[in-house]
């Protein structure tokens, strides 16, 4: 698994460097998670032909994965820092159950899957410190999450492969949109 942000050899070799700002730390954290997703996608794509499927075909699924929309205030048109930040945190909290599902779905990248999950928890904490309006953030219901997890794990092998691929792709897209918006804040 890759070394978590702030622990690479460059950081150790340069103790005199300015400490990272909150925004830089968040930026680095998201890039670290994106690297992890990239490694997981490699294993998934090597194992099945899901990665060749068209986006349109993959869109026909019953997963309710978080996605950015105009109303969320994270795009240039209608950009709203506070609304967007709430959407990012809420979306990441909603992704947590899907990241839990990804655990045990990988053979050679088991550690990587765990790293993505744990790094996302840390990212949520970073972002919650940045948010002013924490009351607007709705936390997913644990009972609903538990039954969703059971349902996903009961799928046949092909559907589980498809689900894994969709989660990774959607999570990547959500993080990309989130980071682009955060870079405007």
């Amino acid at each position: 698994a890759p070394v978590p942000p702030g622990e690479d050899s460059k950081d150790v070799a340069a103790p005199h460097r300015q400490p990272l700002t909150s925004s830089e730390r968040i930026d680095k954290q998201i890039r670290y998670i994106l690297d992890g997703i990239s490694a997981l996608r490699k294993e998934t794509c090597n194992k099945s032909n899901m990665c060749e499927s068209s986006k349109e075909a993959l869109a026909e699924n019953n997963l309710n994965l978080p996605k950015m929309a105009e109303k969320d205030g994270c795009f240039q048109s209608g950009f709203n820092e506070e609304t967007c930040l709430v959407k990012i945190i809420t979306g990441l909290l909603e992704f947590e159950v899907y990241l839990e599902y990804l655990q045990n779905r990988f053979e050679s990248s088991e550690e990587q899957a765990r790293a993505v999950q744990m790094s996302t928890k840390v990212l949520i904490q970073f972002l919650q410190k940045k948010a002013k309006n924490l009351d607007a953030i709705t936390t997913p219901d644990p009972t609903t999450n538990a039954s969703l997890l059971t349902k996903l794990q009961a799928q046949n092998q092909w559907l589980q492969d498809m689900t894994t691929h969709l989660i990774l792709r959607s999570f990547k897209e959500f993080l990309q949109s989130s980071l682009r918006a955060l870079r405007q804040m």
């Epitope: 890039r31 994106l34 795009f75 240039q76 990547k172 897209e173 990309q176 949109s177 980071l179 682009r180 870079r183 405007q184």
Partner: nanobody
Framework: QVQLVESGGGLVQPGGSLKLSCTTS????????VGWFRQAPGKEREFVAD????????WYAESVLGRFTISRDDAKNTVYLEMDGLKPEDTAVYYC?????????????????WGQGTQVTVSS
């Protein structure tokens, strides 16, 4: 890193149009975000527009919003910058840059590959 080549620059009259292209032979170019920056003589290089791996995620500098359009054709490994209603103050060398994380941004530090630039001159 990917090798980027800009083209499409030239001399145009105020109010005219140009379409810049940024092309690469890189295999996974569709996964990169691409930004356009420009540098006028004696000035700092500045952000113009960018497009994410998801083509709907586009951002523009206030000065070009509504006049310039960024788009991508992943089948051709090319990102375009369509510039309409050009003004003399748009005169600059235009550079494209790529971000392997597919995110982009309005600062140069977010990009890991750069092209050599193409000259755009707006003058009557």
């Amino acid at each position: 890193q990917v090798q980027l080549v800009e083209s499409g620059g030239g001399l145009v009259q105020p109010g005219g149009s140009l379409k810049l292209s940024c092309t690469t032979s890189g295999r996974r170019f569709s996964e990169y975000a691409v930004g356009w920056f420009r540098q006028a003589p004696g000035k700092e290089r500045e952000f113009v527009a960018d497009i994410g791996e998801q083509a709907e995620n586009t951002w523009y500098a206030e000065s070009v919003l509504g006049r310039f359009t960024i788009s991508r054709d992943d089948a051709k490994n090319t990102v375009y910058l369509e510039m309409d209603g050009l003004k003399p103050e748009d005169t600059a060398v235009y550079y494209c840059a790529a971000d392997k994380y597919g995110v982009g941004g309005n600062a140069q530090g977010y990009y890991d590959s750069w092209g050599q630039g193409t000259q755009v001159t707006v003058s009557s």
